[in-house]
Interface confidence: medium
Amino acid sequence: FKVATPYSLYVCPEGQNVTLTCRLLGPVDKGHDVTFYKTWYRSSRGEVQTCSERRPIRNLTFQDLHLHHGGHQAANTSHDLAQRHGLESASDHHGNFSITMRNLTLLDSGLYCCLVVEIRHHHSEHRVHGAMELQVQTGKDAPSNCVVYPSSSQDSENITAA
């Protein structure tokens, strides 16, 4: 499977909420011995590989924001910790996987990465990630609502797998 990023750029005004989205593509094994670990983190555009470095989102690490569920299940974070930081990640039955950030500030601008790890038999792992940019703007040039820019078909599926 691969991860697609439907939107590569989100431009939002300060104080707005935004939901960043990734989508699982391709066959997803729903066997009882297959589970998915999904999470989010901030990163930088490395020269070698985007999303290599894992930085916290609002002081929460990728471990704090994870979802872990079977292939056929939906899930969302109920962590008080995440919600206290204005964050919530969620996953539905259709392969969509998102993080919602509330009350955006300029400090939230940057590169965001979704990570999906498919775990088979509790030890074999297949890892994929997707990247998108969030720009939070203030002042007269800021949009009144979030504006999203679709990824090109090439960009949305050029996600590394390991």
């Epitope: 589970t35 670990y37 994870h66 509790h122 030890h123």
Partner: antibody
């Protein structure tokens, strides 16, 4: 803060079994795998196996298959490793360590010394 | 099973020196991880995903490599860096460690 606290040192006779505990705190126990690694005196690190508290799934290095048993008690956030049919070469420090999927073992217990001697 | 071979086994050096150690895998791995261990202590994660510093690790440590050949570099040795360093792979079951490289004071 994240902590993994292991049970105390053990002295066992050859052929006996030992069960070591590892109590986790400061993080969501079911969001990680709990790994067990051992280190014989003056030697390197050797991975024994892992357990997923999320669903109880286990994996073992072939060397330990059938002799090591990994279990968890999610109600107390405690992982256990039992090693049976002990022999002198099992004398080692045994560590538990947490690992997030797609990551590394970022927190380790303090280690439990198991001495096997007649 | 993927065998990880570290070299050299031991390095004698002085504080301030630059040091490079290698980890060679018997078949290709996606990522390499590095741990530091001091006598009487549990291992400590240094590098994840080949080249990224774990939380709290000084910038004098760096990792690189791909495929079967990986490297850990310390740009300028500090007294607290004298320890044993292990590489480890999660790419293939069973998960294996290298035998370690010991850095000792000259």
């Amino acid at each position: 803060q994240v902590q993994l606290v292991q049970s105390g040192a053990e002295v066992k006779k050859p052929g006996a079994s030992v069960k070591i505990s590892c109590k986790a705190s400061g993080f969501s126990f079911t969001g990680y795998t709990m790994n067990w690694v051992r280190q014989a005196p003056g030697q390197g690190l050797e991975w024994i196996g892992l357990i997923s508290p999320y669903n109880g799934g286990t994996s073992y290095a072939q060397k330990f298959q059938g002799r090591a048993t990994l279990t968890v008690d999610t109600s107390t956030s405690t992982a256990y490793m039992e090693l049976s049919s002990l022999r002198s070469e099992d004398t080692a420090v045994y560590y538990c360590a947490r690992r997030a999927y797609g990551y590394a073992m970022d927190y380790w217990g303090q280690g439990t010394l198991v001495t096997v001697s007649s | 099973e993927i065998v990880l071979t570290q070299s050299p086994a031991t390095l004698s050096l002085s504080p301030g020196e630059r040091v490079t150690m290698s980890c060679s895998a018997s078949s290709s791995v996606s990522y390499m991880y590095w741990y530091q261990q001091k006598p009487g202590q549990a291992p400590r994660l240094l590098i994840y995903d080949t080249s990224n510093l774990a939380s709290g690790v000084p910038a004098r440590f760096s990792g690189s490599g791909s495929g079967t050949d990986y490297t850990l570099t310390i740009s300028s040795m500090e007294p607290e860096d004298f320890a044993v360093y292990y590489c480890q792979q999660w790419s293939s079951y069973p998960f294996t460690f290298g035998q370690g490289t010991k850095l000792e004071i000259k």
